[in-house]
């Protein structure tokens, strides 16, 4: 059992091409940093894996369609939004996100767990920030993205709690 750090999340929901007045920010302390994650802030556009059956990102060939800076081929800073489960470990998911160029990995919990979060253990996958958020929050974000809403998340280090029991997948 180890201590766990919460994550402050500032999430923006923006309908593209409508201007800044349509941006809604939502501040909460609803995430927890992974046990092997760097304890540092990170921000980016949330990007789920391509394809309806790829939410768990357990296939090593999983891809992400990353938005680019307007008028260029330069990718914006982004965070992989991945669902827990599917037969692979947290480390597998986070490492894949890192390999694809993500600045961080946001893992959301299984369906049916509502807003429950757990401390993730992901030895070896230590290059990018990794947090877990609840299923309700993750599903809301995912559905927004699927409707064409761009969702940006700013993650900051919260408070220390613990000890909790670690989970690897």
């Amino acid at each position: 059992a180890e201590a766990v750090w919460t994550a402050y999340l500032n999430v923006s929901w923006r309908v593209p091409h409508t201007g800044v007045n349509r941006t809604v920010w939502e501040l909460s302390e609803e995430g927890v940093y992974g046990q092997d994650s760097p304890l540092e802030p990170v921000a980016g556009v949330l990007v789920p894996p391509d394809g309806p059956g790829a939410l768990n990102a357990c296939n090593p060939h999983t891809n992400f369609t990353v938005p680019t800076v307007w008028g260029s081929t330069v990718q914006v800073s982004w965070l992989a939004l991945i669902q827990r489960g599917g037969g692979c470990t947290f480390a597998d998911k986070i490492h894949l996100a890192y390999e694809r160029g993500a600045s961080g990995a946001v893992i959301f919990n299984f369906p049916g767990t509502r807003n429950e979060v757990i401390p993730m253990s992901h030895p070896g996958a230590v290059d990018i920030v990794a947090i877990m958020i609840g299923n309700l929050k993750g599903t809301k974000i995912l559905q927004s993205i699927q409707r064409g809403i761009q969702v940006t998340m700013v993650i900051e280090v919260g408070k220390k709690h613990g000890p909790w029991v670690n989970h690897y997948s």
């Epitope: 593209p16 091409h17 201007g19 800044v20 941006t23 921000a43 800076v69 307007w70 800073s77 761009q150």
Partner: nanobody
Framework: QVQLQESGGGLVQAGGSLRLSCAAS????????MGWYRQAPGKEREFVAA???????YYADSVKGRFTISRDNAKNTVYLQMNSLKPEDTAVYYC????????????WGQGTQVTVSS
């Protein structure tokens, strides 16, 4: 209404340096990203560099390692330090404010001319 005032352009010899500035005034929402684009004669406007609210910067491959973008949030100003300039950098440089996120069409300034002679 937003006003973007670019300055710092001019004529410089190849290998030289220039520093462009862009001061934004009017309605500026905390949370806008800023950047620079350029347009050479007879060519389309192209992305040069951008900076988000923190310290994340983005560069076109053609300027990476030579140009540096920075911002002063207190002054609502963005800068573009251009070193090792080449004749192909000659263009009108436009300041950009991304009111709708980095991925969407920005609001442009009037532009400042940069000419690099060989």
């Amino acid at each position: 209404q937003v006003q973007l005032q670019e300055s710092g352009g001019g004529l410089v010899q190849a290998g030289g340096s220039l520093r462009l500035s862009c001061a934004a005034s009017g309605y500026i929402f905390y949370g806008v990203h800023m950047g620079w684009y350029r347009q050479a004669p007879g060519k389309e406007r192209e992305f040069v560099a951008a900076i988000d609210l923190g310290t994340t910067t983005y560069y076109a491959d053609s300027v990476k390692g030579r140009f540096t973008i920075s911002r002063d949030n207190a002054k609502n100003t963005v800068y573009l330090q251009m070193n090792s300039l080449k004749p192909e950098d000659t263009a009108v440089y436009y300041c950009a404010v991304y009111f709708d996120g980095l991925t969407n069409l920005p609001y442009w300034g009037q532009g400042t001319q940069v000419t690099v002679s060989s």
